[in-house]
């Protein structure tokens, strides 16, 4: 407990003081107080630095007195040998003696005493900022007029924070401003505009006197921005040494104006305004903005577009533009989206051809299309290359969004037919030589494949039989090879609407309009053995001269049998259709008179009893095209004769040519369009 | 498949705060704005704010500037909305959504009721 | 804050029956609108964007058209599952706004 007076006496005094003593004493008196410490006897074994008996007397970590000896007091009015003052209300009193005594010493008796301080004047630091006053046992400190005392009581400041600046325009000064600001004090003003506008805030050089910083260029008054997680500043010295007009980008403002004890200076001023906060022109790609402007702020709205072959998407679904407006964070909406490159996606499958996988589906990228060669060519050009476009779809230049069309390749047989002599006087042939060539097995005939869906024959095989099973790619027909060859199924058998049908076909003297077409349900795959035979043009480089060559081939009788397992062929040429009228008919049916013959029947044969004969009806009579010598087209149809080996008669097929492209048109499938 | 699944009902007294829980699924919130969008009883849809998660950004309705705190926290891949100082008439469903051109994907909501 | 005002506020009609309804943006919104339906009980649902583009799943009875102020949504034919209520909403500029809506019913 601190007491205000009290004494302190060595170990036995007044008798000596033993050998190896160490005593010490606190010393403690009220806070606000000194201690005045005084001895009245001092009698301690002498040594050098007082090293082996001593009195020391410790104060905090500072040594302020040690004492041995005999002291006597020099003032006869005063019994004080020695005395110590000190302005702390502590003080630490030590004893120590050594093994050893020479002489019988009697120690030391002192007195303490709690004594006042002057707060105000005893210490280097001065406590008060500004006015210091000192009582007994304490000190207060006080302030000039129009400063307050701080927290701490002892700092004095001016009373400049805590205004709030909410208009969009205004003007802050330090206080007292153009006069000296006061010391040690912190001013602290806050603009708040309205969210979306930032605070602009102005000065000038000569309205700025701050005191200037220390030699390591440290402010010792200071004025600093804060705005948000952005601070500008300290800025100090003559003249404002920052930027005169700093854009905040906030729209919330701190002002902090802090000072020392010393060096004032006449302040600052400064005015602020509220600029709409501005959005950066961001460099968004394959993108333009409208309107176009140097700059954009708060509630300004731009229409990003996004260039041709780009655009925005969300999901499953896509856009070419979008709206982005300037808001009250200084930052664009929809920043998010992005103008990315059209995807085209994984282009559509050809039926007879292939498209090649694309490395890339986005705008710009480009595929080909080809057809499955020999046997398919693109029949709407266009070259098969397509490109990306910009509005999402594979386009060609030709074509545009249009898919290529692989159609059968006509009248291209694999194998060329060689005539290995000695039909009737034909030859054996393969059907890589005719790869159009279908056979009919009720009745037993022929017929010429055309394209995917249509086989062409004579009217009078199908008049009985409106279903007939047809073979494709075959060159036997025996029934186990059959069984292995393509087996094609009817849809509908159109009759040319000229052939006259008959309640006996077995009397029939009139083959006029002797064609029919057969509409097949599935498509014919096309192949070395199975591929179209070309239909005649309609110039007039396919009407037939006399003595042109063609091929016919089938599987009827022959000269040894009724019916042929293995296709035959024969090459033979066209004739004046007097030659087939002057042939006697063999077992006829009618008057020989009774026979009809017209243009849309061409005579062939002659020539080393080469000729088509009951069985072969229906196939094509294939004559080398005028105009491109590596194809064969449909000349004619095998139809009737008046006898086997000798001449025939076959439907000229260019005749029919409009019906047969009428026909097929009007009973199309969507994907054959 | 794209889901936002919201927090449970609550009801809170009048003056205390609500906070609603969004969580996606399906897609990163990083790449699309979370908005947050409410329904009063027998009323229309009301705009409350948005977040873009990628960086913190938020933007809200005037109406509730103050009172509305919108969060997202992407490790979680979850949105929040809190509202403060609830009164009466903060009784409401509470809708969560995700867009970047549209509001695409919505949460089931989440009925907040303030009754004393 | 730019306003959303939409008409009717409801009305009655009938399986098959051709129903526009309108909603009008206080300013100039450019194609910015979208249309949501909503049923009781669920969250709304995306139908039309941009102002007159279908979102993907929507049948094609129901079409947007407009720019500027006037927008228009149409269902040419409707459905039984249609009967709920439409909002319009402006995504031109934040605060994102929508319309009151506009309550269908069967009639």
């Known amino acids: 407990e601190p007491t205000m007076y009290g004494e302190i006496l060595s170990p036995n005094y007044p008798q000596a003081y033993p050998s190896e003593v160490e005593k010490s004493w606190d010393i403690e008196v009220p806070e606000g107080y000194g201690i005045h410490l005084y001895f009245t006897h001092l009698d301690i074994e002498l040594s050098e630095n007082c090293a082996y008996d001593s009195v020391q007397i410790i104060s905090g970590d500072t040594e302020e007195g040690r004492l041995c000896g005999q002291r006597s007091s020099n003032n006869p009015h005063s019994p004080i040998v020695e005395e110590f003052q000190v302005p702390y209300n502590k003080l630490q009193v030590i004893f120590k003696s050594d093994f050893s005594n020479e002489e019988r010493f009697t120690g030391f008796a002192a007195y303490y005493v709690a004594t006042d301080i002057n707060e105000c004047t005893d210490f280097v630091d001065v406590p008060c900022s500004h006015f210091c006053n000192n009582f007994i046992g304490g000190y207060f400190c006080s302030c000039p007029p129009e400063y307050f005392l701080h927290d701490d009581m002892k700092n004095c400041g001016v009373n400049c924070s805590g205004d709030v600046f909410t208009a969009l325009i205004g003007e802050i000064a330090s206080p007292n401003y153009p006069k000296p600001y006061p010391e040690n004090s912190r001013c602290e003003y806050q603009i708040r505009l309205e969210k979306g506008f930032q605070v602009v805030v102005t000065l000038r050089r000569e309205d700025f006197d701050v005191e200037a910083a220390d030699s390591a260029g440290n402010c010792l008054d200071s004025l600093v921005f804060v705005a948000g997680d952005r601070q500008f500043g300290p800025y100090c010295g003559h003249g404002f040494p920052g930027p005169l007009n700093i854009e905040t980008k906030s729209n919330a403002l701190d002002i902090i104006f802090q000072t020392d004890l010393t060096g004032q200076k006449k302040g600052w001023k400064l005015r602020y305004h509220g600029d709409p906060m501005p959005c950066p022109k961001e460099d968004t790609p394959n993108s333009v903005w409208e309107p176009d402007k140097a700059k954009y702020v708060f509630r300004d709205v731009v229409q990003i577009t996004c260039l041709d072959g780009f655009e925005v998407v969300e999901g499953r679904v896509g856009a070419t533009s979008f709206y982005s407006t300037c808001q009250s964070n200084g930052k664009w909406s929809n920043s998010k989206l992005k103008c990315q490159p059209v995807d085209c996606g994984i282009p559509e499958s050809i039926e007879n051809g292939k498209v090649e996988d694309p490395e890339s589906t986005l705008f710009g990228s480009v595929i080909r299309y080809t057809c499955e060669e020999p046997y398919y060519y693109m029949e709407n050009g266009g070259g098969g290359e397509y490109h990306c476009a910009g509005n999402g779809s594979w386009v060609n230049e030709v074509l545009g969004p249009e898919l290529p069309k692989c159609v059968p390749v006509c009248g291209v047989p694999r194998e060329p037919f060689e005539e290995k002599q000695r039909i009737i006087g034909g030859s054996d042939a393969d059907i890589k030589n005719f790869p159009w060539q279908v056979f009919f097995d009720n009745p037993w005939a022929g017929g010429a494949l055309i394209n995917e869906y249509w086989v062409l024959t004579a009217a009078h095989v199908v008049e009985g039989n409106r279903e007939p099973t047809m073979y494709v790619g075959s060159t036997s027909v025996q029934t186990s090879r059959l069984a292995k060859s393509k087996m094609l199924t009817p849809e509908h058998v159109f009759i040319h609407p000229g052939w006259k049908l008959l309640e006996v076909p077995e009397g029939r003297t009139n083959f006029d309009n002797d064609i029919a077409l057969v509409r097949l349900k599935d498509p014919v795959k096309m192949g070395p053995t199975v591929s179209p035979i070309c239909l005649p043009g309609t110039s007039s480089d396919y009407n037939l001269m006399d003595g042109d060559l063609g091929l016919i081939s089938g599987w009827g009788r022959t000269e040894k049998r009724d019916r042929a397992v293995r296709l035959k062929a024969a090459r033979l040429p066209v004739a004046p259709l007097r030659k087939c009228k002057e042939v006697k008919v063999e077992k006829p049916t009618a008057d020989a008179e009774a026979y009809v013959f017209t243009p849309n029947m061409i005579c062939a044969g002659g020539e080393k009893g080469m000729d088509s004969c009951k069985g072969d009806s229906g196939g094509a009579f294939a004559v080398q095209d005028p105009n491109d010598k590596t194809k064969f087209y449909a000349a004619g149809l095998v139809s009737w004769g008046p006898q086997c080996g000798t001449y025939g008669l076959y439907t000229r097929v260019k005749n029919y040519v409009d019906w047969i492209m009428k026909t097929m048109q009007e009973n199309s499938t969507p994907r054959e369009d | 498949q794209v889901q936002l699944v919201q927090s449970g009902a609550e009801v809170k007294k009048p003056g205390a705060s609500v906070k609603v829980s969004c969580k996606a699924s399906?897609?990163?919130?990083?790449?699309?704005?979370m908005h947050w969008v409410r329904q009063a009883p027998e009323q229309g849809l009301e705009w409350m704010g948005w977040?873009?998660?990628?960086?913190?950004?938020?933007i809200y309705a005037q109406k509730f500037q103050g009172r509305v705190t919108i969060t997202a926290d992407t490790s979680t891949n979850t949105a929040y909305m809190e509202l403060s100082s609830l009164r009466s008439e903060d009784t409401a469903v509470y809708y969560c959504a995700r867009s970047r051109l549209f509001f695409a994907y919505w949460g089931q909501g989440t009925l907040v009721t303030v009754s004393s | 804050d730019i306003q959303m005002t939409q008409s009717p506020k409801s009305l009655s009609a009938s399986v098959g029956d051709r129903v526009t309804i309108t909603c009008r943006a206080s300013?100039?919104?450019?194609?910015?609108l979208d249309w949501y339906q909503q049923k009781p009980g669920q969250s709304p649902k995306l139908l039309i964007y941009?102002?007159?583009y279908r979102y993907s799943g929507v049948p094609s009875r129901f079409s947007g058209s407009g720019s500027g102020t006037d927008f228009t949504l149409t269902i040419s034919s409707l459905q039984p599952e249609d009967f709920a209520t439409y909002y319009c909403q402006q995504q031109y500029t934040t605060p994102y706004t929508f319309g009151q809506g506009t309550k269908l019913e069967i009639k």
């Open positions: 399906g897609f990163n919130i990083k790449e699309y704005y």
């Open positions: 300013q100039d919104v450019r194609t910015a």
């Open positions: 977040i873009d998660p990628e960086n913190a950004d938020t």
């Open positions: 941009s102002a007159s």
